[in-house]
């Protein structure tokens, strides 16, 4: 938890941020909260980024003030204007780019004082894997596919029956660059699978971890998948 303290000559206010990750091409949120003020016109929010010329976003006197906004954020940022009065200074970032990664500062001025807190924002690509039985293969085979990952992840197979088993010898993983030349499609094939077993395809990079499960029995196939962002911590 990062708590910001004020500048001399004025009281300090508490500002809290949460480290987070953005999925490139999608919208992201940079979280920041502060001790609220009773008057919206007294609140100034400034978002800054290390190494950037100008501001990421500025909100003052109840509206956006973008005359000093950096070009790389133009048309891509917004605060939740109706929630500023209750202490929400979070920033919505549209169409997240790899280059948006870095250290951000949420800087707040209210009638009570000033405060700021830093936030580490990671960017990459992550997506839910889908595991299917590959009926085209000569032997019982599973195919795990996830459309968008960056940086290149690791892929590990596991099974409920053979817990702790190493499937690297009986699996093959490939990474195919997508058309935008950054993210990659992940395809992993597991050979010699047995019936009445649950297999998991786990994809992980330094931003996210995703798992696709498949349970294969003689009568049915059940699938489940989930995704978890890594290293999201409060500041």
């Amino acid at each position: 938890l990062i708590i910001g303290f004020g500048i001399s000559g004025r009281h300090s206010i508490t500002v809290t941020t949460v480290a987070s990750a953005g999925n490139i091409g999608e919208d992201g949120i940079l979280s920041c909260t502060f001790e609220p003020d009773i008057k919206l016109s007294d609140i100034v929010i400034q978002w800054l980024k290390e190494g950037v010329l100008g501001l990421v976003h500025e909100f003052k006197e109840g509206k956006d003030e973008l005359s000093e906004q950096d070009e790389m954020f133009r048309g891509r940022t917004a605060v939740f204007a109706d929630q500023v009065i209750v202490g929400n200074a979070s920033l919505r970032l549209k169409n997240v780019q790899l280059t948006d990664a870095g250290t951000y500062k949420c800087y707040i001025i209210t009638s009570k004082g000033k405060g700021n807190a830093n936030l580490e924002y990671k960017t990459g690509a992550f997506s839910m894997p889908e595991v299917n039985v590959d009926y085209n293969a000569s032997s019982e085979t599973l195919r795990c596919e996830a459309p968008r990952w960056f940086p290149q992840p690791t892929v590990v197979w596991a099974s409920q029956v053979d817990q702790g088993a190493n499937f690297s010898e009986v699996s093959n993983t490939s990474f195919e660059l997508n058309s935008e030349n950054v993210t990659m499609k992940v395809v992993s094939v597991l050979y010699n699978v047995t019936i009445n077993n649950t297999y998991s395809c786990m994809i992980e990079n330094d931003i996210a971890k995703a798992t696709g499960d498949i349970k294969v029995t003689e009568s049915e196939i059940k699938r489940r998948s989930h995704l978890q962002l890594l290293n999201s911590k409060a500041s």
């Epitope: 190494g51 010329l53 100008g54 000093e68 070009e71 790389m72 030349n181 950054v182």
Partner: antibody, heavy 119, light 107 residues
Framework: EVQLVESGGDLVKPGGSLKLSCAAS????????MSWVRQTPDKRLEWVAA????????YYPDSVKGRFTISRDTATNTLYLQMSTLKSEDTAMYYC????????????WGQGTLVTVSA | DILMTQSPSSMSVSLGDTVSITCHAS??????IGWLQRKPGKSFKGLIY???NLEDGVPSRFSGSGSGADYSLTISSLESEDFADYYC?????????FGGGTKLEIK
């Protein structure tokens, strides 16, 4: 069409001062961050100064900090570089550059103006 | 400061060839890299920004790739107008720093 035209380059003695100008046209001047970049006689490029869209934020490398000042005049669409306490290592071709709309740096360049610092 | 090491410093190539120029940053720069071109007798112009994106009006035979600290500019099917000087530049932190340049010459 984006046009950047530098002027003010000259031969000056070490310790002297000089003010470079860059006349900008073909775009909304107040909407773009601007920079000065120099190319030394050995062809190396060195970023010298940058100024934000509204002019409130300026940055310099340590090599010129305290000696060079970047400024802009929105009324006349002009970028300036005030150089003082000039040294022989400041000898270079100085270019005015404009950022791209998407946040790229050094998308557009002028033709340059030559500054020679010599006794 | 981030040091940008560009290679090669010069190369002789033929029309129609495909060439790659590389830049290594002294630390990861998260795609905050641009590539510039300077044709003989002309000024500089931006070619690529954010590692992979073409600036307006740049032909599609130019492409950028890379991640972390290593990036490259590739020109496929070289045309006569592509013989020029090329520079990389990082803009992840101040000061902005440039590579030493690559001179592309006709063989």
């Amino acid at each position: 069409e984006v046009q950047l035209v530098e002027s003010g380059g000259d031969l000056v003695k070490p310790g002297g001062s000089l003010k470079l100008s860059c006349a900008a046209s073909g775009f909304t001047f107040s909407s773009y961050g601007m920079s000065w970049v120099r190319q030394t006689p050995d062809k190396r490029l060195e970023w010298v100064a940058a100024i934000s869209t509204g002019g409130s934020y300026t940055y310099y490398p340590d090599s010129v900090k305290g000696r060079f000042t970047i400024s802009r005049d929105t009324a006349t669409n002009t970028l300036y570089l005030q150089m003082s306490t000039l040294k022989s290592e400041d000898t270079a071709m100085y270019y005015c550059t404009r950022r791209g709309a998407t946040g790229s740096w050094f998308a557009y360049w002028g033709q340059g103006t030559l500054v020679t610092v010599s006794a | 400061d981030i040091l940008m090491t560009q290679s090669p410093s010069s190369m002789s190539v033929s029309l129609g060839d495909t060439v790659s120029i590389t830049c290594h940053a002294s630390q990861g720069i998260n795609n905050n890299i641009g590539w510039l071109q300077r044709k003989p007798g002309k000024s500089f112009k931006g070619l690529i920004y954010h590692g992979t994106n073409l600036e307006d009006g740049v032909p599609s035979r130019f492409s950028g790739s890379g991640s972390g600290a290593d990036y490259s500019l590739t020109i496929s099917s070289l045309e006569s107008e592509d013989f020029a000087d090329y520079y990389c530049v990082q803009y992840v932190q101040f000061p902005r720093t440039f590579g030493g340049g690559t001179k592309l010459e006709i063989k």
